[in-house]
Each structure stands twice: as structure tokens, then as C-alpha cells.
């Protein structure tokens, strides 16, 4: 079994989590990728996923989550904008590779969001940016129902996510367009 490691990100409300998940581009460039949250005692929940096959550098936005898959670089960029305290939790990037089990990328992310004014609103990049705009995109992202031989119960897929605009106030703890996806390592 792969040793699971966690990387802690401590950010303030209003800031942006910006994670770069690397992958072997020759193997996984066009594979569908997802961003999941892992709650204690539960299966990982998929919050957002890229299209299938994944489109190069095409942003997928689900509420305050933006995924960008850079095939040329073997890099999945995940951003969670306008962070809220309730977003705190354990997250991970995965690659869907049916019929095999999902492949976990990178370290798991332990996100801790605290209240308080951020000197760099909307970013965790130490104020080095001079341009940072979230484009008002609308993307339908259908995340697959993943069946694992080790999983006996499986939630049926709900409606496809169709959430737009950067100021969409979706509380990630109450996202309804979620599919439970088992991840084994």
C-alpha cells in the first residue's frame, strides 16, 4: 500500500487555494481527473471533475472550484476561490482509469481556513500577481459513477453539475451534485 502523506495549507477566508497536481503526461494526459474531499468515516466525494476525455487547458468550473488540466505539462491545477471556514478538510486529486481503481495524485491536501482579513484577497500567492481574474464560465461536468470490486454500496449519480459565475456562493459542505467515488491506494 502506498504511504499516504498530507500537505497542510493554512489560508484565510476569501483567499484562493491553488494546488498543482503532477502526473505522468504520457500515461494520463487525456484521462479524466477529479478533485475530491475525504470526510472521516466516509468514501471520498467528488466535488469537480474534468471532461472525458480531459480537454487540454480547458477550465472546468463547479461553483468556487476551477480545474485546469495542462496535458502538455502533465499538470492538473485546482483552485478553490473565495475560501470559507467550512471548506476546511482533507482533499485529493485523482485520475479515473476504469476499470482499474482511481489513481491518487500528489499528497493529500489538509486545508485549514481561518477567519480574518486577508492582506491578499483571493490568492495565496504572496501578492506577486498583478492580474488574477476568474472568468465567468459555465461548464457541465459529468463525473462518472465509479464501481469498485471492493465496494458493495454505491450512490446513484445525480444531475450533472451546472454552476457558473465566480461569485457563486456554493457552500462546499452542501454540494448536491456529488458522486461518491472510492479511492484505494
Amino acid at each position: 500500500a502506498t504511504k499516504l502523506t498530507e500537505e497542510k495549507y493554512e489560508l484565510k477566508e476569501g483567499q484562493t487555494l491553488d494546488v498543482k497536481c503532477d502526473y505522468t503526461l504520457e500515461k494520463f494526459a487525456s484521462s479524466q481527473k477529479a478533485w475530491q474531499i475525504i470526510r472521516d468515516g466516509e468514501m471520498p466525494k467528488t466535488l469537480a471533475c474534468t471532461e472525458r476525455p480531459s480537454k487540454n487547458s480547458h477550465p472546468v468550473q463547479v461553483g468556487r472550484i476551477i480545474l485546469e488540466d495542462y496535458h502538455d505539462h502533465g499538470l492538473l491545477r485546482v483552485r478553490m476561490v473565495n475560501l470559507q471556514v467550512e471548506d476546511s478538510g482533507l482533499y485529493q486529486c485523482v485520475i479515473y482509469q476504469p476499470p482499474k481503481e482511481p489513481h491518487m495524485l500528489f499528497d493529500r491536501i489538509r486545508l485549514v481556513v481561518t477567519k480574518g482579513f486577508s492582506g491578499t484577497p483571493g490568492s495565496n500567492e504572496n501578492s506577486t500577481q498583478n492580474v488574477y481574474k476568474i472568468p465567468p464560465t459555465t461548464t457541465k461536468a459529468l463525473c462518472p459513477l465509479y464501481t469498485s470490486p471492493r465496494t458493495v454500496t454505491q450512490a446513484p449519480p445525480k444531475s450533472t453539475a451546472d454552476v457558473s459565475t465566480p461569485d457563486s456562493e456554493i457552500n462546499l459542505t452542501n454540494v448536491t451534485d456529488i458522486i461518491r467515488v472510492p479511492v484505494f491506494n
Epitope: K20, D22, S57, D72, H73, G74, L75, V131, Y132, K133
Partner: antibody, heavy 116, light 107 residues
Framework: EVQLVESGGGLVQPGGSLRLSCAAS????????MSWVRQAPGKGLDWVAS????????YYVESVKGRFTISRDNAKNSLHLQMNSLRAEDTAVYYC?????????WGQGTLVTVSS | EIVMTQSPATLSVSPGERATLSCRAS??????LAWYQQKSGQAPRLLIY???IRATGIPARFSGSGSGTEFTLTISSLQSEDFAVYYC?????????FGGGTKVEIK
């Protein structure tokens, strides 16, 4: 084959300006972040600036903020670096590179010398 | 700003021997670390990204390891074309920062 060809370097006096250009080919320019990285003579590598495909995100190293401007023309597959108020410490080979975080492909570089 | 420190500054190795280069970050960069090779008079070339993933076309004798703040580039059996300067670079956060480099020279 990916090709990145820089131009526009040369000798300039302190306080002067230069505009570097980079002609890109062999890949889908409009789908890639692009950056400039520099290397002072006999020294190591220093990141200068990065720009997203649609220029919606631009980042600079602190020492060039307010003096340098990175831009791109996706229709012409070209990347630019406008350098104003140049200082002696800006003397370096400037590389045009593909990527916004790590750098998969590099040009051969163009030398910028700031001296009186 | 994340400071990257490489050691040693110079490494003298005989052809066919193993070379181990170290890179340390002043704070955790997770696995967002790349290694580059630069030969004299040439532009750098990406060797490793994601701390341990070989870039396209890079020989298997190059391997990377580590996570967080401590990273290693290993060249299992040095070939004549491997004598060069090697740089590590973090890309967890802007500003992107490089290490000062390790020169691998012939012993």
C-alpha cells in the same frame, strides 16, 4: 518540434528600455502558459514573469514589478517582455520558456547588457 | 519567498559512478519540485518534475525523490554527457524560485 526563438536583446544604458520578443512554433501556443527566465553571466537561474494563455493571470518577481511587462499575441504565436528603467543588475541572458510553473521547453536566450 | 538551497556546490565524480545531489526548501513545497540540467553554453533542460516524474525523453538513470522540504536527484551511472550544472526549482507558490545549482564535474 517545439521551437522558441528570442530576439531584441542588446546593449542599453541604465534607465533605458528594451522590448524582447519570442517566436513560438511546434506546439499550441494559445493553450500554454509562457514565462521569461533569466541568467546573469556566470550565475544561476532566476524566474522573471509568467502569463496565462488568455493573460487573465500574470505574475512577476518582486524586483521587476512596475518596470517589466509581460504580454502575448496568440494570433501571432509570440511572447513579449517590455523592460523599462533598466538597471545593471538586469544584465542577463533572457530565456523564453514554455510553462507557467515549471519549464518544459526553452529558447536559446537573448543577451541583455545594461551598462553605461 | 521560498528559498531553495542545493548541496554540494560542486560534485566530483568518475564516469560510471553514482551521483547524488540534494535540494532543500525553506518551507514545504509538497511535490512541486523540478530538476533541470544545463550544459555549458546551452539552455537548461527539464529532467524531473513532480519531484520524481521523469520528463519526456529523459534516460532512466536519472531519478528524483523526496517531498516537503528535502529532495534528491540521483544519476545512477554517470555518462560523459551528464557532466553539467543541475538546478532544482519549486513551483508550489509564486515567486518561482531556483536553487543555486550543483556543478557535476569529472573526477
Amino acid at each position: 518540434e517545439v521551437q522558441l526563438v528570442e530576439s531584441g536583446g542588446g546593449l542599453v544604458q541604465p534607465g533605458g528600455s528594451l522590448r524582447l520578443s519570442c517566436a513560438a512554433s511546434g506546439f499550441t501556443f494559445s493553450s500554454n502558459w509562457m514565462s521569461w527566465v533569466r541568467q546573469a553571466p556566470g550565475k544561476g537561474l532566476d524566474w522573471v514573469a509568467s502569463i496565462k494563455q488568455d493573460a487573465s493571470e500574470i505574475y512577476y518577481v518582486e524586483s521587476v514589478k512596475g518596470r517589466f511587462t509581460i504580454s502575448r499575441d496568440n494570433a501571432k504565436n509570440s511572447l513579449h517582455l517590455q523592460m523599462n528603467s533598466l538597471r545593471a543588475e538586469d544584465t542577463a541572458v533572457y530565456y523564453c520558456v514554455r510553462g507557467g510553473w515549471r519549464f518544459e521547453s526553452w529558447g536559446q536566450g537573448t543577451l541583455v547588457t545594461v551598462s553605461s | 519567498e521560498i528559498v531553495m538551497t542545493q548541496s554540494p556546490a560542486t560534485l566530483s565524480v568518475s564516469p560510471g559512478e553514482r551521483a547524488t545531489l540534494s535540494c532543500r526548501a525553506s518551507q514545504s513545497v509538497s511535490s512541486n519540485l523540478a530538476w533541470y540540467q544545463q550544459k555549458s553554453g546551452q539552455a537548461p533542460r527539464l529532467l524531473i518534475y513532480g519531484a520524481s516524474i521523469r520528463a519526456t525523453g529523459i534516460p532512466a538513470r536519472f531519478s528524483g525523490s523526496g517531498s516537503g522540504t528535502e529532495f534528491t536527484l540521483t544519476i545512477s551511472s554517470l555518462q560523459s554527457e551528464d557532466f553539467a550544472v543541475y538546478y532544482c526549482q519549486q513551483y508550489k507558490n509564486f515567486p518561482l524560485t531556483f536553487g543555486g545549482g550543483t556543478k557535476v564535474e569529472i573526477k
